[in-house]
Amino acid sequence: MQKGDQNPQIAAHVISEASSKTTSVLQWAEKGYYTMSNNLVTLENGKQLTVKRQGLYYIYAQVTFCSNREASSQAPFIASLCLKSPGRFERILLRAANTHSSAKPCGQQSIHLGGVFELQPGASVFVNVTDPSQVSHGTGFTSFGLLKL
Amino acid sequence: MQKGDQNPQIAAHVISEASSKTTSVLQWAEKGYYTMSNNLVTLENGKQLTVKRQGLYYIYAQVTFCSNREASSQAPFIASLCLKSPGRFERILLRAANTHSSAKPCGQQSIHLGGVFELQPGASVFVNVTDPSQVSHGTGFTSFGLLKL
Amino acid sequence: MQKGDQNPQIAAHVISEASSKTTSVLQWAEKGYYTMSNNLVTLENGKQLTVKRQGLYYIYAQVTFCSNREASSQAPFIASLCLKSPGRFERILLRAANTHSSAKPCGQQSIHLGGVFELQPGASVFVNVTDPSQVSHGTGFTSFGLLKL
């Protein structure tokens, strides 16, 4: 894109972080080989990417997790990419589901989500999972990002 | 992006190739329905995509493999997207892990990696896997590419 | 990209739809949180994304499915991203394969495909699967899109 000041590049890539919070929303950090192009996209409260400009964005997330069928609920592991726009209810943009592995003690699996969506100024995107304790936080395994078209 | 000569499009998409090399680095070729936009991105030694211009790039890889749990080590199949910048050590950008299947003789699985990263002039990206003999090289199953924002 | 009228943004994201058709080509709709930037990309017959302008496009698809090894053929579940250019034969751009789960009644798995390809004016892309009856059409699980670089 290599845009001028009127039209700067906007992109982010953040890295997963283990959290003591008992929430299904994954936590992220600007650490390791992260990307934060400028202040037109920000990581808020370690949980959501918020954009200042309206437009089309390619948004993606990757989640690696380790689970076992016997030790988990019958429901699959689901990762959801969600949107919160100002004055609107949250909504699901993308989801992926993987049934738990029969491998012991747990079987690793990776999920990738990605798509093009219109975001309003102040819109935030975040990632939900069914069980955050199963998520792998080793280098490169779980990440989240976006780029403005 | 449709950029002028000062700011040309930079993109690549290369196709996996079976190799007699006993290395964990996957081999690629400009064959089939490949993309190589211009000489600002090149495929070097059939193993790495090297860029001439600094900037933000969306880099991705897809690896399909066939493996069996009994015949494999307990470790999962891991695909890693790695970066080598001039004068720097290699580093992992992204990884995905899938536990081997119990299917006989082997169970196929596909991994997709992708993210936005800042690359320096002369930086190279490549893909590592735990066992290249398990990788599927049928049409469309395993590929690697990037695009400059 | 934020382009002028001469060079508008071109992007689409469409949502899967269950179909009574006995075809392996997945059906899509402009519903929910979909994207259709302008008439330079269109959804035709609910099955293919067709572009009016030549250029490089990042094309992606995500398919979530639920299958069981005993109830399925020995062949894996395969999702294919295919191209039909005017006056040319169809060709496979990308494929992913996942062996069926042993989970009962079925095990869910998600596949993600994505890559950069040159498209000609009037070119269409579509998604084929081995068994459409296994595809999950819940919110966000199965989608298809593209963006012009």
Epitope: - | C66, N68, A71, D131, S136 | -
Partner: nanobody, 115 residues
Framework: EVQLVESGGGLVQPGGSLRLSCAAS????????MGWFRQAPGKEREWVST???????AYADSVKGRFTISADNSKNTAYLQMNSLKPEDTAVYYC?????????WGQGTLVTVSS
């Protein structure tokens, strides 16, 4: 192009033995496994046995203890020693291998177990 050629099939009495061979030819860069499937008349093709590149063998329950798979990696050849054959082992036996990143199949060899 890689090819798989089976040999060793034939007619044998119940309780007898046969040794099948599968030779891979062509430019072979990598091998993950070689092995066997079989298809009895009017039935689906079923997996029989596999030997993986690390030497690990695997067998279907129906042939465990009677069949032994082995490989000569220097010759890109796999062998299936079939002992204590039963009439229900009658089938076309297909060599299957994961070579150069793809599933390859032989043309098949007929094994008939009958008195």
């Amino acid at each position: 192009e890689v090819q798989l050629v089976e040999s060793g099939g034939g007619l044998v009495q119940p309780g007898g033995s046969l040794r099948l061979s599968c030779a891979a030819s062509g430019r072979i860069f990598s091998t993950y496994f070689m092995g066997w499937f079989r298809q009895a008349p009017g039935k689906e093709r079923e997996w029989v046995s596999t030997i993986y590149s690390n030497g690990t063998p695997a067998y279907a329950d129906s042939v465990k203890g009677r069949f032994t798979i082995s490989a000569d990696n220097s010759k890109n050849t796999a062998y299936l020693q079939m002992n204590s054959l039963k009439p229900e082992d009658t089938a076309v036996y297909y060599c299957a291998a994961w070579l150069n990143g793809g599933n390859r199949w032989g043309q098949g060899t007929l094994v008939t177990v009958s008195s």
